[in-house]
Interface confidence: medium
């Protein structure tokens, strides 16, 4: 079941899914001047069985002026830099392996991909929040939101996070923070403060999570 809405907006915070539940869809969107090839996939879909999850389909973009070329997959370094720093994706992670069963990792970029990713989350998806650069977490409750089904309707739980405008930041050492998007909402899923996993195991982020998953730009 798809979640009706996006995760809640928290002022001066961004969110990220560490892994995507099976059934999650990612729009195949192209940057300005490019379009999805006519025979190309409309979206990527996280699918799998009990032991293995992966993204079905590949997104392909071509120049809007050219109807037949089908360039795809890895962007060049200059194209990589065009992606907005709010996205905090990790190209180093394998596409088809997730630390949680029944979940997919962040899909790798494709050539001429749009600067924003639109995911369609499913019930049970968890996302994690973190204050943007220049703000720190005032209240460190569970900084996460879960899409739940209640009385036949989907809703996101409210994350217990308040970001206050102080120069001191709540980053982990050596970590670079994302910038807030111009409209004040995440341009895509971004990084987080993790307190639980999908299995509700209490974790200490700095100790258990690799900082590579929080990189703000493609290397």
């Amino acid at each position: 079941e798809l979640c009706d809405d996006d995760p809640p907006e928290i002022p001066h915070a961004t969110f990220k899914a560490m892994a995507y539940k099976e059934g999650t869809m990612l729009n195949c969107e192209c940057k300005r001047g490019f379009r999805r090839i006519k025979s190309g996939s409309l979206y990527m879909l996280c699918t799998g069985n009990s032991s293995h999850s992966s993204w079905d389909n590949q997104c392909q973009c071509t120049s809007s002026a050219t109807r037949n070329t089908t360039k795809q997959v890895t962007p060049q370094p200059e194209e990589q830099k065009e992606r907005k720093t709010t996205e905090m994706q990790s190209p180093m992670q394998p596409v088809d392996q997730a630390s949680l069963p029944g979940h997919c990792r962040e899909p790798p970029p494709w050539e001429n991909e749009a600067t924003e990713r639109i995911y369609h989350f499913v019930v049970g998806q968890m996302v994690y929040y973190q204050c943007v650069q220049g703000y720190r977490a005032l209240h460190r409750g569970p900084a996460e939101s879960v899409c739940k089904m209640t009385h036949g309707k989907t809703r996101w739980t409210q994350p217990q996070l308040i970001c206050t405008g102080e120069m001191e930041t709540s980053q982990f050492p050596g970590e670079e923070k994302p910038q807030a998007s111009p409209e004040g909402r995440p341009e895509s899923e971004t990084s987080c403060l993790v307190t639980t996993t999908d299995f509700q195991i209490q974790t200490e982020m700095a100790a258990t999570m690799e900082t590579s998953i929080f990189t703000t730009e493609y290397q």
Epitope: L2, D5, N27, E29, R35, R36, L42, Y43
Partner: nanobody, 123 residues
Framework: QVQLQESGGGLVQAGDSLRLSCAAS????????LAWYRQAPGKEREFLAA???????FYANSVEGRFTISRDNPKNTVHLQMDGLKPEDTAVYYC?????????????????WGQGTQVTVAS
Amino acid sequence: QVQLQESGGGLVQAGDSLRLSCAASGRSFRNYILAWYRQAPGKEREFLAAISWLDGTFYANSVEGRFTISRDNPKNTVHLQMDGLKPEDTAVYYCAADRGPVRPVLAPDVDYWGQGTQVTVAS
């Protein structure tokens, strides 16, 4: 409550152009596609075009090249520019909002519908 309100329909001559608009309200439409359908008398409702938040588009073969869908996100509005209209384009045109990624949505699966606006193309 979600509301979709179409406007811009009317009577035109064959070969003319018309621009339909649809104002969406009542929720955030970021995770929704906005789409246009039409229904001619005695026929099934027919998918025409859809557009995502990031301007990813999908067209029915019958209108690709003649119709252009566009979206104004700050205003939650979607437009359908119809050029080279033909008498067979005469129908009630419906705006629709559908959760999920851009795809050629089947009419029964659509989450929200507008009331429709009549377009008549005279020969």
